[in-house]
């Protein structure tokens, strides 16, 4: 997993990396395998009804450093993990949803009786 503190520009890989893709397969993927010059990823996020959805696939080198950093997004429960160490390495990534914060249960201001 990429560490939050990493800020150096990503180094181009000398060879293409193959990743498993699910719910996130580009047109050039075959048999749920995509190829990239960047990272493989697996992501878990809540859908509109609050159910966890896992997607996986390829991230191109451009912008992947930021995407793999897993910066928290307000009002969105989501976690992403990235890898490059071997082909289809994202099969072994199992990100978990961050815990609910108290305010996530609250739709509006609290009214005391």
């Amino acid at each position: 997993k990429k560490e939050d503190g990493e800020s150096t520009a990503p180094t181009p890989r000398p060879k293409v990396l193959r990743c498993k893709c699910h719910h996130h397969c580009p047109e050039d993927s075959v048999n749920n395998i995509c190829s990239t010059d960047g990272y493989c990823f697996t992501m878990i996020e809540e859908d509109d009804s609050g159910l966890p959805v896992v997607t996986s696939g390829c991230l191109g080198l451009e912008g992947s450093d930021f995407q793999c950093r897993d910066t928290p997004i307000p009002h969105q429960r989501r976690s992403i993990e990235c890898c490059t160490e071997r082909n289809e390495c994202n099969k072994d990534l199992h990100p978990t949803l961050p815990p609910l914060k108290n305010r996530d249960f609250v739709d509006g201001p609290i009214h005391h009786r």
């Epitope: 993927s29 191109g60 082909n87």
Partner: antibody, heavy 116, light 112 residues
């Protein structure tokens, strides 16, 4: 200097097995894929498949899947292409080729002749 | 599979003249990363192919600057600006965007 040196020409009978080799030197063998490409007599080039020697991950052209096996031994920087039962139609020149995002270096080729 | 179609199948050009070979793919070769993995190879009799141009327009190291590549999407061109005797060969376009990777049928270039 990047070099891919392939094993010598082979003459085989139908039904026989065969394993040809391709030794890479002058670069980090595990930093590139190795592909195998077939060229039948007087014909064009056909991609058979490839292997990433760092993890032995293979991809095959569906046309050749089950017909050949691609393997590698990173300890001796060598990739292999093998047949368990040759056919006359396997008569061709076989090239190994280094692949990153495109093939940049090719072996000299191994001629395989299958005839009864 | 992506079909790569080259034209013409054969070409005769006078020494010093321009030679142009076209390559058309059955689908776009723009990869999801934004790269276009279309390449050109030269093969002389009894020899393995040699890389000339990678990713549409990048000359490989040691390739003379009379060779150039252009195009986008599905249509690509290899140009030899001034034909030399040593350029007599078969030229192949190739794509590595989609698996299985495929080659054009080849264009035989001769001297007129």
């Amino acid at each position: 200097e990047v070099q891919l040196v392939q094993s010598g020409a082979e003459v085989k009978k139908p039904g026989e097995s065969l394993k040809i080799s391709c030794k890479g030197s002058g670069y980090s063998f595990t930093s590139y894929w190795m592909q195998w490409v077939r060229q039948m007599p007087g014909k064009g080039l056909e991609w058979m498949g490839e292997i990433d020697p760092s993890d032995n991950y293979t991809l095959y052209n569906q046309k050749f899947k089950g017909q050949v096996t691609i393997s590698a031994d990173k300890s001796i920087s060598t990739a292999y292409l093998q047949w368990s039962s040759l056919k006359a139609s396997d008569t061709a020149m076989y090239y190994c080729a280094r692949f990153g995002y495109y093939v940049d270096y090719w072996g000299q080729g191994t001629t395989v002749t299958v005839s009864s | 599979d992506i079909v790569m179609t080259q034209s013409p199948d054969s070409l005769a050009v006078s020494l010093g003249e321009r030679a142009t070979i076209n390559c058309r793919s059955s689908q776009s070769l723009v990869h999801s990363t934004g790269n276009t993995y279309l390449h050109w190879y030269q093969q002389k009799p009894g020899q393995p192919p040699k890389l000339l141009i990678y990713k549409v327009s990048n000359r490989f190291s040691g390739v003379p600057d009379r060779f150039s590549g252009s195009g986008s999407g599905t249509d690509f061109t290899l140009t030899i600006s001034s034909l030399q005797a040593e350029d007599v060969a078969v030229y192949y376009c190739s794509q590595s965007t989609h698996v299985p990777f495929t080659f054009g049928q080849g264009t035989k270039l001769e001297i007129k």
